[in-house]
């Protein structure tokens, strides 16, 4: 098991729009139709003002109007919920579809896409119903923008909630070589298909993807627990033939100085098809992007039952070393290295300030907001501090899969 690793199934807590944990000052918009439809009126289930945020401009055809929520700290956002305008039950404005953009630093914005590259999310069919959208893959974000859409000139209004949990790993980005394709009886695509950073010259940098999405792969890397996805989907993999150095090098950037106890790497070991655990791992540490690597690298040779073909989490001790950047080399012990998840066990160094602009107020690991309770068809789960359930039969959730 990935000790200390977050469980995406439990990361579904209301982040504070409905219960006002998110203050008005952290909700903004590109424009508002009037003060009574300002951004602060965009809270799910709220009837404040004229009952929603409504942009001043048309969202057709440009789709440039947005509602922005600042979560103040990095969160894993697993679901979003939307509603139209309340207006004492007389509101007629809602958004049939929308896009999401998100940012971890307030500078670089990424468009959310589902596992098949679709950006447009099905929204509401009426002004009052709440429609929840499972975000597969989830997004690691501090700021989230909702861009309502329309297929003609019309008024749209929006109330929203976000659901997820605090991103306590603190990982801002990882840099890695682009994953490769293995050819068996069918092509096995071992690329990082949800990576949200840049790709240049065979290197991915500045983003997060499948190695940080909480989903660990199966023993047989050709199979996935996700439906309707290609062979190899859960894993990112590299062939020994492509690396004359004999290792794959990755770099990890964190939000602030941390003391690192361990790195956990979920690896495939289906050696009959060429996948092997790394023979060893070597990590270097530094406190800033332009600083020198400090001290001796931490080296860890992997023992254990290498003949056991089951996938497993390998724990690499990091000795409490303090850093904001890690560079790790994973040594080939066979034809292929296949990873499905990498996580870190670390503690924030108390006197360190965050790498992102501004100082963040403390936030609980589980935000206190309960899930919405006005559905008759929620899953049968206790209320209060429980992950939010999907509104059964909601038209939003369109997974292209089996």
């Amino acid at each position: 098991d990935m000790k200390g690793h977050f469980d995406p199934a439990k990361c579904r807590y209301a982040l504070g729009m409905q219960d006002r944990t998110i203050p008005d000052s952290d909700i903004s918009a590109s424009s508002s139709w009037s003060d009574s439809t300002a951004a602060r009126h965009s809270r799910l289930e709220s009837s404040d003002g004229d009952g929603a945020w409504c942009p001043a401009g048309s969202v057709f055809p440009k789709e440039e109007e947005y509602l922005q929520v600042d979560l103040q700290r990095l969160h894993l956002v697993a679901l979003v919920g939307t509603q139209g305008r309340h207006a004492g039950g007389l509101g007629k404005e809602f958004s049939r579809s929308y896009r999401l953009r998100y940012s971890r630093d307030g500078r670089r914005w990424m468009g959310w896409k589902d596992r098949w590259g679709q950006e447009v999310i099905s929204g509401n069919e009426d002004p009052e119903g709440v429609v929840l959208k499972d975000l597969g893959p989830p997004m690691v974000a501090r700021l989230v923008r909702f861009y309502p859409r329309a297929d003609r000139v019309m008024s749209v209004c929006l109330r929203v909630e976000l659901y997820g949990c605090l991103w306590r790993d603190g990982l801002l980005s990882y840099t890695a070589p682009v994953g490769q394709t293995m050819y068996l009886s069918e092509a096995v695509y071992l690329n990082d298909s949800t990576y949200d950073g840049h790709t240049v010259g065979g290197l991915q940098y500045g983003g997060l993807g499948q190695l940080a999405d909480g989903v660990v792969g199966l023993d047989d890397f050709r199979k996935s627990q996700e439906l309707r996805v290609w062979p190899g989907y859960d894993y990112v993999g590299w062939s020994n033939h492509s690396f004359s150095s004999g290792y794959v090098e990755m770099e990890f950037e964190f939000d602030r100085l941390r003391a690192f106890q361990a790195m956990q790497v979920h690896c495939n070991n289906m050696h009959t098809l060429g996948a092997r655990l790394p023979g060893g791992v070597e990590c270097r540490f530094r406190r800033g992007p332009a600083m020198a690597w400090e001290g001796e690298p931490m080296r860890h040779n992997l023992g254990g039952n290498l003949g056991d073909p089951r996938a497993r989490a390998v724990s690499v001790p990091l000795g409490g070393r303090v850093a904001r950047f890690l560079q790790c080399r994973f040594l080939f012990a066979g034809p292929w290295l296949l990873f499905s998840e990498i996580s870190f066990i670390s503690d924030v160094v108390n006197n360190s300030s965050p790498a992102l602009g501004g100082t963040f107020p403390p936030a609980p690991w589980w935000p206190p907001g309960p899930p919405p309770t006005n559905f008759s068809s929620l899953e049968l789960e206790p209320r209060g501090q429980q992950p939010v359930a999907k509104a059964e039969g909601s038209p939003t959730i369109e997974f292209r899969m089996d």
Epitope: A9, K10, D134, G136, S185, E186, A187, Y189, V215, L218, R222, K223, S224, Q225, E226, L227, R228, V229, W230, P231, Y233, E379, A389, K390, E392, G393, S394, T396, I397, F399, M401, D402
Partner: antibody, heavy 117, light 111 residues
Framework: DVHLQESGPDLVKPSQSLSLTCTVT?????????WHWIRQFPGNKLEWMGY???????KYNSSLKSRISITRDTSKNQFFLQLKSVTTDDTGTYYC??????????WGQGTLVTVSA | DIVLTQSPTSLAVSLGQRATMSCRAS??????????MHWYQQKPGQPPKLLIY???NLESGIPARFSGSGSRADFTLSINPVEPDDVATYYC?????????FGSGTKLEIK
């Protein structure tokens, strides 16, 4: 391995609702996979009815959409089938099963449901 | 909906010989360079059992006597050599498009 077991009444009257439970052991239904209901008619024809995804979303066979509902209770690791307004044509063996991107790898043993007055 | 047509409806093969059965889809079930077609074996009183996934991959624990081939809309399941335990009905199933559909089955008997 994942183990699934169907349970529910074996006789339902026409126009009533059919309700079945699938209890899953050795695996959490919120951790992965899609959790499906499939039925087999007396002539052995197999029909996929719908699923609930591990993330909570549902998808139904359009031929049943107005009558079917699949829900779950994650605390009990169970998922449920409700089929409304049944007729004698709904008689058959009902299976719960799970799938990833490689077909229905795990099946329950099935439960025979007869719709009869 | 994608219709899967299996042929023959029934098949009698001598022990030790090869059995071959076909599944034809009304449209392609390929995507991402792979075929979302799977094969199952069902014996009386039992649920279907996954044999082959994504056209040609042998499910773990299934003997190598079973093999699958094909792409797009034409697929074949072969059993070589046939053994007494193989007497069953064999179904193909596609998961490329909702709703997922099954073929009507091929019943294998021993001559």
């Amino acid at each position: 391995d994942v183990h699934l077991q169907e349970s529910g009444p074996d006789l339902v009257k026409p126009s009533q609702s059919l309700s079945l439970t699938c209890t899953v052991t050795d695996y959490s239904i919120t951790s992965g996979y899609g959790w499906h209901w499939i039925r087999q008619f007396p002539g052995n024809k197999l029909e996929w009815m719908g699923y609930i995804h591990y993330g909570g979303s549902t998808k139904y066979n359009s031929s049943l959409k107005s009558r079917i509902s699949i829900t779950r209770d994650t605390s009990k690791n169970q998922f449920f089938l409700q089929l409304k307004s049944v007729t004698t044509d709904d008689t058959g063996t009902y299976y719960c099963a799970t799938s990833g991107n490689y077909g229905f790898a795990y099946w329950g043993q099935g439960t025979l449901v007869t719709v009869s007055a | 909906d994608i219709v899967l047509t299996q042929s023959p409806t029934s098949l009698a093969v001598s022990l030790g010989q090869r059995a071959t059965m076909s599944c034809r889809a009304s449209e392609s079930v390929d995507d991402y360079g792979t075929s979302f077609m799977h094969w199952y074996q069902q014996k009386p009183g039992q649920p279907p059992k996954l044999l082959i996934y994504r056209a040609s991959n042998l499910e773990s624990g299934i003997p190598a006597r079973f093999s699958g081939s094909g792409s797009r809309a034409d697929f074949t399941l072969s059993i070589n050599p046939v053994e007494p335990d193989d007497v069953a009905t064999y179904y193909c199933q596609q998961s490329n498009e909702d709703p997922f559909t099954f073929g009507s089955g091929t019943k294998l008997e021993i001559k």
